[in-house]
Amino acid sequence: LVPHLGDREKRDSVCPQGKYIHPQNNSICCTKCHKGTYLYNDCPGPGQDTDCRECESGSFTASENHLRHCLSCSKCRKEMGQVEISSCTVDRDTVCGCRKNQYRHYWSENLFQCFNCSLCLNGTVHLSCQEKQNTVCTCHAGFFLRENECVSCSNCKKSLECTKLCLPQIENVKGTEDSGTT
């Protein structure tokens, strides 16, 4: 049975691990290229070397492969507050991260933005800031949590969720309003 040439995974599984099937001759298994290199020419025949070349500056391959081109190195996104943790090498992509006292918020699987860790002013740190999660704050009495900041109950409108947390304060405000009308 001739494997479907369009399906790389199926083609590779015909050969032992670390080898791939020659695209023009499915009876030949060629050795894959090491990480940090790419496929320049397929092996001419069984037991003969694959012609692999090292990735050029600005590109990499992180695992053994038979790619015709190395992958372009990622760039850290300044507009998202990202900084370079380690630069790209021939066998490893750029590693981007955030500065000290910042955390990553993932907008999607491969896009993150750096934000400052909350300081929990008018509250206490319940859970410390982590690489991918902001500080979790618990607010002092008279304050409620809004977008991970402790906000004074004087800013609590009756329609908001904060009414439960700020109930005594709201009652007090209501009480002073009542007494002012007499």
Partner: nanobody, 119 residues
Framework: EVQLLESGGGLVQPGGSLRLSCAAS????????MVWVRQAPGKGLEWVSH????????YYADSVKGRFIISRDNSKNTLYLQMYSLRAEDTAVYYC????????????WGQGTLVTVSS
């Protein structure tokens, strides 16, 4: 007062094109990276694309890469999204927004423009 006003949405056939615009006012547009996000019916917000202050660095979600182009004209205070080879799954309300700074929430975004891709 910050205002973002999207336009250019409409009904288009699969494979068709549209150009969305977002007119900005009430802030220094040239100082802010800008974002396009979308919300398909019954789904959450999806980050589509963003662009830096000067229009040099751009980002595209994998689902739109090679089909959409984000751009901006700082002299006109306008953000654009050129959409090609539209698919049914691109049907959504498209919003422009200022890239958040203080935390992972959109403080400023428009009312949205509906893009419907259907034959």
């Amino acid at each position: 007062e910050v205002q973002l006003l999207e336009s250019g949405g409409g009904l288009v056939q699969p494979g068709g094109s549209l150009r969305l615009s977002c007119a900005a006012s009430g802030f220094t547009f040239a100082h802010e990276p800008m974002v396009w996000v979308r919300q398909a019916p019954g789904k959450g917000l999806e980050w589509v694309s963003h662009i830096d202050r000067v229009g040099q660095d751009t980002y595209y979600a994998d689902s739109v890469k090679g089909r959409f182009i984000i751009s901006r004209d700082n002299s006109k205070n306008t953000l654009y999204l050129q959409m090609y080879s539209l698919r049914a799954e691109d049907t959504a309300v498209y919003y422009c927004a200022i890239l958040p700074k203080r935390g992972p929430r959109f403080d400023y975004w428009g009312q949205g423009t509906l893009v419907t891709v259907s034959s």
